[in-house]
């Protein structure tokens, strides 16, 4: 459960954080799992532990393996595992999948590519950026802090981006590279009058008294990023927060989904321990944006338990 994959290239720096967190004051011990041998804390060692961090300066293929970190809190020793793999440097330009960090998407309006794991290192600007092994040049590319900004993004900008920086440890410099894919979203967006997909207008939802019930209000508002769009529930025309029934709560945070390229939102209304009086309420699913407001009304009805005859 508390396990994390980390990878790096031989002769580069690799810094791994313990998957278990803890206060800065907590002691963290590191072990090489296969031998249960303690990792030293002295910085003169090539591989050493520094609190929550395990440092390979530089890494070697033979360092691959599982490392155990134990965070010693006042009450418990909390254990985490770092699964470290060090790969040989590739002679050709291709970056294999196993060295890739998570893919990021960009669009004309938002084209930031963050350099993965950089926050673990002691580095100084500027970062060097490469696309498909070529150094990025030209005014469209701006290395800013720990990310790359691409102006006027085009579909041709999709590809594998590598950031390269220098980690400094006690005056010694070590190279680090990290690669991730960048995809470009077509953002010919538009906005339209809200369309409520669920619930249906005047829907009757069957519920069981004493059980929990969920109602989902789901609506779409157009394509691409929407400037203003919201879905919410009302009870008898009153906002949930103002209604004052703690059993009935809206799910915090609206889920944004892109169904068939459409920008949609949903809000779940959770009713705990359904009571008779809940059947008397009017439940309104509201969807609104700059075009206007659409409302679908739901009522609850009692689900009759099925009679079991022998």
């Amino acid at each position: 459960k508390f396990s994390k994959q980390s990878w790096g290239l031989e002769n580069e720096a690799l810094i791994v954080r313990c998957p278990r967190q803890g206060k800065p004051s907590y002691t963290v011990d590191w072990y090489y799992s296969q031998t249960n041998k303690s990792i030293p804390t002295q910085e003169r060692n090539r591989v050493f532990a520094s609190g929550q961090l395990l440092k390979f300066l530089p890494a070697a293929v033979a360092d691959s393996g599982i490392y155990t970190c134990i965070v010693r809190s006042p009450t418990f020793n909390r254990t985490g595992y770092a699964n470290v793999t060090i790969y040989k440097k590739q002679s050709d330009c291709n970056v294999p999948d196993y060295l890739m960090y998570s893919t990021v998407s960009g669009s004309e309006k938002n084209s930031k590519i963050y350099c993965p794991t950089i926050d673990l290192y002691n580095w100084t600007a500027p970062l060097e950026w490469f696309k498909n092994c070529q150094a990025l040049q030209g005014s469209r590319y701006r290395a800013h802090k720990s990310f790359l900004v691409i102006d006027n993004v085009m579909t041709e900008d999709a590809g594998d981006y590598t950031c390269k920086f220098i980690h400094n440890e006690n005056g010694a410099n070590y190279s680090v590279t990290a690669t991730r894919s960048f995809t470009v979203k077509d953002e010919q967006g538009f906005s339209l009058f809200p369309v409520i997909g669920a619930p249906a207008q005047n829907e009757i939802k069957e519920v069981e008294i004493g059980k929990n019930a969920n109602l989902t209000c789901s609506a779409c508002f157009g394509k691409g990023t929407q400037f203003l769009a919201a879905v919410l529930w009302q009870l008898n025309g009153t906002k949930i927060t103002d209604f004052g029934e703690p059993r009935i709560q809206q799910e915090e945070g609206q889920n944004q989904s892109f169904s068939n390229g459409l920008a949609c939102l949903d809000m779940v209304l959770r009713i705990a321990d359904v009571k008779e009086e809940d059947l008397l309420l009017q439940y309104d699913c509201l969807a609104l944006n700059l075009h206007g407001l659409r409302r679908h009304t739901v009522r609850l009805s009692r689900k009759n338990p099925i009679d079991h005859h022998s």
Epitope: R20, Q21, K23, T75
Partner: antibody, heavy 121, light 106 residues
């Protein structure tokens, strides 16, 4: 939302044992340690101990060591605290509680409703 | 064990007053947590890690301090703040609480 629901009030005789349960919901039970705190009538709060439901590891206030047993049933997401050799000064409300962020010990953010245990002959 | 000493043990203040409670630890602690408890209810976390406001807690509550001396403040006392307040350290086993400060309205 996180909920901790405790068992009902108990009346026990001196020398007996009591087992209080705490059923957790709204989160992954094994992701958070469960702590036990008690409060005697009109008195302050006193930490008794804790259990890590994932491993079964326990941590105790030395004052209760040997008298208290903490267990956890992963299948029902329920933690138990058993206190033996009861005496009148064990009369208290017993709470189960957990931190908001387990690894960072950011205070007891979630509490059960409390279980009143009365020790009387 | 780290002993936590709260002062005052009780205090009476008027609505709108600034109220301060102190907590002194018998040896240095890294962080302090503060709780509010109303009669017949479980305690409620107000401040964690000395100065961080717990979720949903009004901003009139605040905390500060370091080492052995910590302070809890209500900037403008409200009628609903009538309760007993406890400090708690999580720096060493056993975890310990202050004896409580009972707050009343004048």
């Amino acid at each position: 939302q996180v909920q901790l629901v405790q068992s009902g009030a108990e009346v026990k005789k001196p020398g007996a044992s009591v087992k209080v349960s705490c059923k957790a919901s709204g989160y992954t039970f094994t992701d958070s340690e469960m702590y036990w705190v008690r409060q005697a009538p009109g008195q302050g709060l006193e930490w008794m101990g804790a259990i890590d439901p994932e491993t079964g590891d326990t941590a105790f206030n030395q004052k209760f060591k040997g008298r208290v047993t903490m267990t956890a049933d992963k299948s029902t997401s329920t933690a138990y605290m058993e206190l033996s050799s009861l005496r009148s000064e064990d009369t208290a409300v017993y709470y189960c509680t957990r931190a908001f962020d387990n690894d960072n010990d950011e205070g007891f953010a979630y509490w059960g409703q409390g279980t009143m245990v009365t020790v009387s002959s | 064990d780290i002993q936590m000493t709260q002062s005052p043990s009780s205090l009476s203040a008027s609505v709108g007053d600034r109220v301060t409670i102190t907590c002194s630890a018998s040896s240095s602690v890294n962080y302090m947590h503060w709780y509010q408890q109303k009669p017949g209810k479980a305690p409620k976390l107000l401040i964690y890690d000395t100065s961080k406001l717990a979720s949903g807690v009004p901003s009139r509550f605040s905390g500060s301090g370091s080492g052995t001396d910590f302070t809890f403040t209500i900037s403008s006392l409200q009628p609903e703040d009538i309760a007993t307040y406890y400090c708690q350290q999580w720096s060493s086993n056993p975890l310990t609480f202050g004896q409580g400060t009972k707050l009343e309205i004048k």
